[in-house]
Amino acid sequence: MRRGPRSLRGRDAPAPTPCVPAECFDLLVRHCVACGALRTPRPKPAGASSPAPRTALQPQE
């Protein structure tokens, strides 16, 4: 069975992560975790003066 892509990358999107879609990549600890268990700081709210850093990468189908 062929494995489909784990993420779809936009032109400026981060590199794909090794996580299955059920999980998120935690940049702080450098591995996949449940998205609600991320120890990485959450991105800044929209409208902040500078763009929010991508701290948690989540592949989409």
Epitope: M1, R3, P18, C19, V20, P21, A22, C24, H31, C32, A34, C35, G36, A37, R42, P43, A56, Q58, Q60, E61
Partner: antibody, heavy 118, light 113 residues
């Protein structure tokens, strides 16, 4: 076609140990997370834990309810993964399912029944 | 642990009727960075293993009939069967995979009149 077949269930005495197996076919074993879930007779499902794929170093997550007693491992050369259960109790009696994890618990085996009784 | 509560625990409907069942979580399952709700629905027919119907709260698994629809966000979720068929006789479980340990609801048993 994805196929998961559990085995190793049976009758065991309280305090005993049992190792369940899940034979995998139809997909690349090293590329997927694999999970164990159990269901006591007539009751709801309980997630026990999973083992991640090769890209994630086969790391594990466990439900605190079984952590320390249950261990999940895998033998990729034989496309099998395991649930080692120690110090079994009557409340561990259930049907045990293996499941492939991707978007959620995507595919399930047919289950194997464990009965813990004196 | 996140507690998942399903209601009703059972319901009986006639073939062709619309069915709605509820699942509530003790905390939000919405991950704000990607707007995904980490909630799945499973169908378990008598004597069978569970089958994934819906993931991310509203995305239908491949091969699942379009009469099954998942909706909701945050803590309140719904599974709707638009026109029940006899083969839909089953227990339906919701499950969160937002954080560990993954937890399931107690199930809703669908019976056919």
């Amino acid at each position: 076609e994805v196929k998961l077949v559990e085995s190793g269930g049976g009758l065991v005495q309280p305090g005993g140990s049992l190792r369940l197996s899940c034979a995998i076919s139809g997909f690349t074993v090293t590329a997927y997370y694999m999970s164990w879930v159990r269901q006591p007779p007539g009751k709801a499902l309980e997630w026990l834990g999973f083992i991640r794929d090769k890209a994630n170093g086969y790391t594990t997550e466990y439900n605190p309810s079984v952590k320390g007693r249950f261990t999940i491992s895998r033998d990729n050369s034989q496309s099998i993964f395991y649930l080692q259960m120690n110090t079994l109790r009557a409340e561990d009696s259930a049907t045990y399912y293996c499941a492939q994890v991707r978007r959620a618990l995507d595919y399930w085996g047919q289950g194997t029944t464990v009965t813990v009784s004196a | 642990d996140i507690v998942m509560s399903q209601s009703p625990s059972s319901l009986a409907v006639s073939v062709g009727e619309k069915v709605t069942m509820s699942c509530k979580s003790s905390q939000s399952l919405l991950y704000s960075s990607n707007q995904n709700n980490y909630l799945a629905w499973y169908q378990q027919k008598p004597g069978q293993s569970p089958k994934l119907l819906i993931y991310w709260a509203s995305t239908r698994e491949s091969g699942v009939p379009d009469r099954f629809t998942g909706s909701g966000s945050g803590t309140d979720f719904t599974l709707t069967i638009s026109s029940v068929k006899a083969e839909d006789l089953a227990v339906y479980y919701c499950q969160q995979y937002y954080t560990y340990p993954y937890t399931f609801g107690g199930g809703t048993k669908l019976e056919i009149k």
